[in-house]
Interface confidence: low
């Protein structure tokens, strides 16, 4: 069976969100490679005036969990946990709408950062979404965006 690896996170860029928990990587060397890319992206984001506080509070951990997804401990084979689609949609359509539009039209950012495509994520309430990674975005004000 062809699968990836579950390995402890050893990086710095996302350590405050992930710690040394086990993350899913598609190859042995990929963790270091993604760490370099996300470090460069975060450096660029840090110097940008395009990122609002309300967006960055949730976008940064979301990007970390997308780049370094936790391993699904309920699975017998190495398998990544997805981001939760409802949170992904609120992030993209509400909290970070302007930032996403800017990022998707900026090749320098796209070169360094893979943005999650919410449509690829399993629907809320589906069995596949049961173990999704929840960032903790307050839902109440934005509930109508993911019905």
């Amino acid at each position: 069976e062809e699968d990836g690896f579950c390995q402890p996170y050893r990086g710095i860029a996302c350590a405050r969100f992930i710690g040394n928990r086990t993350v899913y990587m598609e190859s042995l060397h990929m963790q270091g490679e993604i760490e370099n890319q996300i470090t460069a992206a975060f450096t660029m984001i840090g110097t940008s005036s395009h990122l609002s506080d309300k967006c960055s509070q949730f976008a940064i951990p979301s990007l970390c969990h997308y780049a370094f997804p936790y391993c699904d401990e309920t699975s017998s084979v190495p398998k990544p946990r997805d981001l939760c689609r409802d949170e992904c949609e609120i992030l993209e359509n509400v909290l970070c709408q302007t930032e996403y539009i800017f990022a998707r039209s900026n090749p320098m950012i796209l070169m360094r950062l893979k943005l999650p495509n919410c449509e690829d994520l399993p629907q809320p309430e589906s069995p596949e979404a049961a173990n999704c990674i929840r960032i903790g975005i307050p839902m109440a004000d934005h509930h109508h965006h993911h019905h």
Epitope: G4, R10, E26, L28
Partner: antibody
Framework: EVQLVESGGGLAQPGGSLRLSCAAS????????IHWVRQAPGKGLEWVGY????????HYADSVKGRFTISADTSKNTAYLQMNSLRAEDTAVYYC?????????????WGQGTLVTVSS | QAVVTQESALTTSPGETVTLTCRSS?????????ANWVQEKPDHLFTGLIG???KRAPGVPARFSGSLIGDKAALTITGAQTEDEAIYFC?????????FGGGTKLTVL
């Protein structure tokens, strides 16, 4: 058919330089890591380093760090090993091997090797 | 740097089962070392057999299998054939580098 073909080996003086090439065919190197591995005469294998042609990320064995540089030209589907400050102990047959980015398949295909001799 | 040790030579007969092992100087070999087995035949013909401890590369016969036995990585050939006569190298991953063993010369008589 997947093939890796090394070239560029030969005789070099101690302190000299050589550049080895690893031309890939039958697959796109951007989907793989390319490793360089060497075998000194009558000895076992020694891992030299790898490149991810997709991003340019590299990693090296301590024995060659600072002297050897691995690069890739994705338009030519070729990886390179630039060897500087060569020493007698670098004498070996140098192989490139591929390692899937996607799956657990390190070193599945190898080239035939190219001999590097460092001698005055 | 870690040292990886293999039997220098083993002899088996056609149809027999033979196990080659791979020991690490740093302690027990674990799945985190992603043990890798490579076959060398005459004229420097190398083929990757096993990656990630126990995952066969495409096209490799099912008689080759990888596992952990005790504190070592192992390559087992179940029903050895004359064409399996070769040198077998194991390689272990140590966080950021691969280390190869010295190789085991397998003779199938």
């Amino acid at each position: 058919e997947v093939q890796l073909v090394e070239s560029g080996g030969g005789l070099a003086q101690p302190g000299g330089s050589l550049r080895l090439s690893c031309a890939a065919s039958g697959f796109n190197i951007t989907g793989y890591y390319i490793h360089w591995v060497r075998q000194a005469p009558g000895k076992g294998l020694e891992w030299v380093g790898y490149i991810s042609p997709n991003s340019g990320a590299t990693h090296y064995a301590d024995s060659v760090k600072g002297r050897f540089t691995i690069s890739a030209d994705t338009s030519k589907n070729t990886a390179y090993l630039q060897m500087n400050s060569l020493r007698a102990e670098d004498t070996a047959v140098y192989y490139c091997a591929r390692d899937s980015r996607r799956y657990v398949r390190p070193f599945d295909y190898w080239g035939q090797g190219t001999l590097v001799t460092v001698s005055s | 740097q870690a040292v990886v040790t293999q039997e220098s030579a083993l002899t088996t007969s056609p149809g027999e089962t033979v196990t080659l092992t791979c020991r690490s100087s740093t302690g027990a070999v674990t799945t985190s070392n992603y043990a890798n087995w490579v076959q060398e035949k005459p004229d420097h013909l190398f083929t990757g057999l096993i990656g990630g401890t126990n995952k066969r590369a495409p096209g490799v016969p099912a008689r080759f299998s990888g596992s952990l036995i005790g504190d070592k990585a192992a390559l087992t050939i179940t029903g050895a054939q004359t064409e399996d006569e070769a040198i077998y190298f194991c390689a272990l991953w140590y966080s950021n580098l691969w280390v190869f063993g010295g190789g085991t010369k397998l003779t199938v008589l």
